[in-house]
C-alpha cells in the first residue's frame, strides 16, 4: 500500500493488497476498503459504472461481467484501485461493439479480457480475412486493443479480438470499424448560376453545392458588405463513404430592387475555407404579351386537323405554359419553344396540334402562360361542325315519343309518319315539345336538342321517323308501331323497316 507523510491525508487501503486479483467464475469477490473517511466503492468496466457505500464489496458468485476496476475513494477524494479478473472459460471477452475511429488518430477496440493469463491477445479479420498490412495495434487486457493511426481505408473493417486458450484460438464478437475522415483539403463549392436578372417581386432562389469528405463541413450564404442572416434550406446526400454533398438553397421570396448585390456561398472545414459568388440584379415589374397567329374563333369539320398557334413575349422567362380544354391540361400534342436561341430572347411560340377533331372536342381551348410577375391567357373558341347524332329515341311512360339529337350547328328535328309498311315517310308530325338541352353531360361542344311528339295520335300500324339535320348532314331513326287488339306495341325497328 502507498505510504504518505504524517499529517497529510492518505489514500484508502484495500484488502487484498494487490493491484490485480484473479478469481474463478462462481467464486466470491470480497474486497475490503479501510479508511477512516471511507466514502464509496466504484466499479468500472467499459461504459458501466456501479457504486457501493459499504466499505466491504462482496459479490457472492462472481460472473465474467464482474471483471473490472474497483476503486475505493475517501472523503479527501483520494482513491486506491484493484483490478479484478473473473476467469470464465466460456466468456473470455467483455465487449462494447461500438467502434469509431477518427482518421489519423488512435481508437480502442473495447474487448477487455476476463483472464489475463491467456496468450496471443490480438486482432483478427472476420471470416479469416487478413488485416490490412499497415494496421498496427497495442493490446491491453484491461482496456482492449488500441488501433494506432486509423486510416480511411479501414472504414467498415470487420474485426474480432482474439486470444489463444489451451492452444486454440478464441474470437470475440465481431466489431465494425467506422472511420470519421479527417479534412485534408478545403471544401469544393459551386453555384447553380453565376448571375440572376429578376423582376421586382419575383422569387430569387440560388443553390450552392458543397462537397466534402463528411457532413461536419460548415457552410453558409453571406451577402457581401452585410451581416444580415440569410434564410437557407438544406438538402444533403452521402454518395458513398467519404463523399458528402450538401445543397444550400438561398431564397428571397419576393425580391426588391435593393436586394441587388453579390451573394457569397462560404464553406470551411478544419483544413481551410472556400467560397463562390453569384450576382443578383433586381429590376421592376415583368410582362407577358400574347399574339394569336390565327383567328381566335375557329370552325373545323368533324375529322379535320387544326393548329392553334400563339406567339408571346415574356420577361422574365416563362415558368409555366399550358393548354387547357374542359379543365383538363394537355400533356402532349403541343410544343413551346423560344423564337430564337439568343440569351436575351424574350419571344416564344406555342403550338397546340389538334388532330382528327371529333364532335365532342369542340369548345374553348385556352393557352395560359405565367412568369413570377404575370399570368396571361388567350382563348380559342373551336366549333366542330358535326352531322347530328341521335342519342336516344324512346317511347316514354306518358305516351310521348322522344328523340334526342346532338350536333353542331344545332340540329333541327323533324317528325314523319309512314302508315303501314310504306318505305317513304312524308306526312309530317308537329312536335309537342322541343328543348335545347344543357350539354354538361355527354357530349360537350355539341348542341343537344330534344323533341317529343304524342304517340297516342297514331291509330294505325306504321313507322315514325325522327330526322335530325343541320348544315353538315342528316340522320334518321325509326320507331315502328303494331296494334294487337287495343294495345299498341313497339316492334324491332330494324326487322320491320329498312330506311
Amino acid at each position: 500500500q502507498p505510504s504518505v507523510s504524517p499529517g497529510e491525508p492518505s489514500p484508502p487501503s484495500i484488502h487484498p493488497g494487490k493491484s490485480d486479483l484473479i478469481v474463478r467464475v462462481g467464486d466470491e469477490i470480497r474486497l475490503l476498503c479501510t479508511d477512516p473517511g471511507f466514502v464509496k466503492w466504484t466499479f468500472e468496466i467499459l461504459d458501466e459504472t456501479n457504486e457501493n457505500k459499504q466499505n466491504e464489496w462482496i459479490t457472492e458468485k462472481a460472473e465474467a461481467t464482474n471483471t473490472g476496476k474497483y476503486t475505493c475513494t475517501n472523503k479527501h477524494g483520494l482513491s486506491n484501485s484493484i483490478y479484478v479478473f473473473v476467469r470464465d472459460p466460456a466468456k473470455l471477452f467483455l465487449v462494447d461493439r461500438s467502434l469509431y475511429g477518427k482518421e489519423d488518430n488512435d481508437t480502442l477496440v473495447r474487448c477487455p479480457l476476463t483472464d489475463p493469463e491467456v496468450t496471443n491477445y490480438s486482432l483478427k479479420g472476420c471470416q479469416g480475412k487478413p488485416l490490412p498490412k499497415d494496421l498496427r495495434f497495442i493490446p491491453d487486457p484491461k482496456a482492449g486493443i488500441m488501433i494506432k493511426s486509423v486510416k480511411r481505408a479501414y472504414h467498415r473493417l470487420c474485426l474480432h479480438c482474439s486470444v489463444d486458450q489451451e492452444g486454440k484460438s478464441v474470437l470475440s464478437e465481431k466489431f465494425i470499424l467506422k472511420v470519421r475522415p479527417a479534412f485534408k483539403a478545403v471544401p469544393v463549392v459551386s453555384v447553380s448560376k453565376a448571375s440572376y436578372l429578376l423582376r421586382e417581386g419575383e422569387e430569387f432562389t440560388v443553390t450552392c453545392t458543397i462537397k466534402d469528405v463528411s457532413s461536419s463541413v460548415y457552410s453558409t450564404w453571406k451577402r457581401e458588405n452585410s451581416q444580415t442572416k440569410l434564410q437557407e434550406k438544406y438538402n444533403s446526400w452521402h454518395h458513398g463513404d467519404f463523399n458528402y454533398e450538401r445543397q444550400a438553397t438561398l431564397t428571397i421570396s419576393s425580391a426588391r430592387v435593393n436586394d441587388s448585390g453579390v451573394f457569397m456561398c462560404y464553406a470551411n472545414n478544419t483544413f481551410g475555407s472556400a467560397n463562390v459568388t453569384t450576382t443578383l440584379e433586381v429590376v421592376d415589374k415583368g410582362f407577358i404579351n400574347i399574339f394569336p397567329m390565327i383567328n381566335t374563333t375557329v370552325f373545323v369539320n368533324d375529322g379535320e386537323n387544326v393548329d392553334l398557334i400563339v406567339e408571346y413575349e415574356a420577361f422574365p422567362k416563362p415558368e409555366h405554359q399550358q393548354w387547357i380544354y374542359m379543365n383538363r391540361t394537355f400533356t402532349d400534342k403541343w410544343e413551346d419553344y423560344p423564337k430564337s436561341e439568343n440569351e436575351s430572347n424574350i419571344r416564344y411560340v406555342s403550338e397546340l396540334h389538334l388532330t382528327r377533331l371529333k364532335g365532342t372536342e369542340g369548345g374553348t381551348y385556352t393557352f395560359l402562360v405565367s412568369n413570377s410577375d404575370v399570368n396571361a391567357a388567350i382563348a380559342f373558341n373551336v366549333y366542330v361542325n358535326t352531322k347530328p347524332e341521335i342519342l336516344t329515341y324512346d317511347r316514354l311512360v306518358n305516351g310521348m315519343l322522344q328523340c334526342v339529337a346532338a350536333g353542331f350547328p344545332e340540329p333541327t328535328i323533324d317528325w314523319y309518319f309512314c302508315p303501314g309498311t310504306e318505305q317513304r315517310c312524308s306526312a309530317s308530325v308537329l312536335p309537342v315539345d322541343v328543348q335545347t338541352l344543357n350539354s354538361s353531360g355527354p357530349p360537350f361542344g355539341k348542341l343537344v336538342v330534344q323533341s317529343s311528339i304524342d304517340s297516342s295520335a297514331f291509330k294505325h300500324n306504321g313507322t315514325v321517323e325522327c330526322k335530325a339535320y343541320n348544315d353538315v348532314g342528316k340522320t334518321s331513326a325509326y320507331f315502328n308501331f303494331a296494334f294487337k287488339g287495343n294495345n299498341k306495341e313497339q316492334i324491332h325497328p330494324h326487322t320491320l323497316f329498312t330506311p
Epitope: 347524332e389 341521335i390 342519342l391 336516344t392 317511347r395 353531360g441 325509326y478 330494324h494 330506311p499
Partner: antibody, heavy 122, light 108 residues
Framework: QVQLVESWGGVAQPGRSLRLSCAAS????????MHWVRQAPGKGLEWVAV????????YYADSVKGRFTISRDNSKNTLYLQMNSLRAEDTAVYYC???????????????WGQGTLVTVSS | SELTQDPAVSVALGQTVRITCQGD??????ASWYQQKPEQAPVLVIY???SRPSGIPDRFSGSSSGNTASLTITGAQAEDEADYYC????????????FGGGTKLTVL
C-alpha cells in the same frame, strides 16, 4: 343470323394494356351503335363504352374514362376496346353488344357476344 | 346503383312471379329487362312499354308504375331460373344507361 364473337381475352399485369375485338356478322354493322358491357366475377352488369354507328362519337363510363378507348372498323365489321393502365378492378367478362335501334347511340341491346374473360393480376 | 332490385326471388314451378326495379328515371322512361343464365351472355326479354323480341315466350311481360318497373313471369318454368337485370336511363340528365344490381330468380 346476328353473331358477335369476341376475341380471346387474357391475363394482364396491373398498369399494362390489352386490346379486345368483336367480329360482327348477320346485320348491317355500319348502321348500328355498338357497346361494351362488363361483368366482374360474381357481380352484376356494368356498361363500359359505346361508339356511334359511324364511329364519330364515343362515350365512356366514369370508371374507365381516360384509360379505355372504343373504336370500330366498319369495313371489317369489327369493334375494338383498347384497355390501357389496367387495374385489378377491371377483371371481368367483357361482352360486346349491338344497339337495337338503327342509328341510335343509346338504347336497348338486342344481341350480345358470348363474352371474354379479362384477368388483371400481378 | 341508381336502379334498385331485390337480390333474390323464388317461385314455385308454374306459379307467377314479379321482379321489381326502382329508380327515379322510371317515372319517365320504361325499363328493359335482360335474362342471364350461368356462364351465358345476357338476353333481352322485355323492352319499351311491354315488347318482347322474337323468340321470347309470352309468359314474360313488363309493366310500369310510378318509379317502379316490373317483370312478370306467368307460369314460371324451370328454364326461367336465371339472373334478371333491369336497364334504363340514368337519372343524372345524361343519356347514359345503367343496369340494376340484378335479381336471382330460383324456380322451386
Amino acid at each position: 343470323q346476328v353473331q358477335l364473337v369476341e376475341s380471346w381475352g387474357g391475363v394482364a399485369q396491373p398498369g399494362r394494356s390489352l386490346r379486345l375485338s368483336c367480329a360482327a356478322s348477320g346485320f348491317t354493322f355500319s348502321s348500328f351503335a355498338m357497346h361494351w358491357v362488363r361483368q366482374a366475377p360474381g357481380k352484376g352488369l356494368e356498361w363500359v363504352a359505346v361508339t356511334s354507328y359511324d364511329g364519330s362519337n364515343e362515350y365512356y363510363a366514369d370508371s374507365v374514362k381516360g384509360r379505355f378507348t372504343i373504336s370500330r372498323d366498319n369495313s371489317k365489321n369489327t369493334l375494338y376496346l383498347q384497355m390501357n393502365s389496367l387495374r385489378a378492378e377491371d377483371t371481368a367478362v367483357y361482352y360486346c353488344a349491338k344497339a337495337m335501334v338503327r342509328g341510335v347511340t343509346f338504347g336497348d341491346l338486342d344481341y350480345w357476344g358470348q363474352g371474354t374473360l379479362v384477368t388483371v393480376s400481378s | 346503383s341508381e336502379l334498385t332490385q331485390d337480390p333474390a326471388v323464388s317461385v314455385a314451378l308454374g306459379q307467377t312471379v314479379r321482379i321489381t326495379c326502382q329508380g327515379d328515371s322510371l317515372r319517365s322512361y320504361y325499363a328493359s329487362w335482360y335474362q342471364q343464365k350461368p356462364e351465358q351472355a345476357p338476353v333481352l326479354v322485355i323492352y319499351g312499354e311491354n315488347s318482347r323480341p322474337s323468340g321470347i315466350p309470352d309468359r314474360f311481360s313488363g309493366s310500369s308504375s310510378g318509379n317502379t318497373a316490373s317483370l312478370t313471369i306467368t307460369g314460371a318454368q324451370a328454364e326461367d331460373e336465371a339472373d334478371y337485370y333491369c336497364n334504363s336511363r340514368d337519372s343524372s340528365g345524361t343519356h347514359l344507361r345503367v343496369f340494376g344490381g340484378g335479381t336471382k330468380l330460383t324456380v322451386l
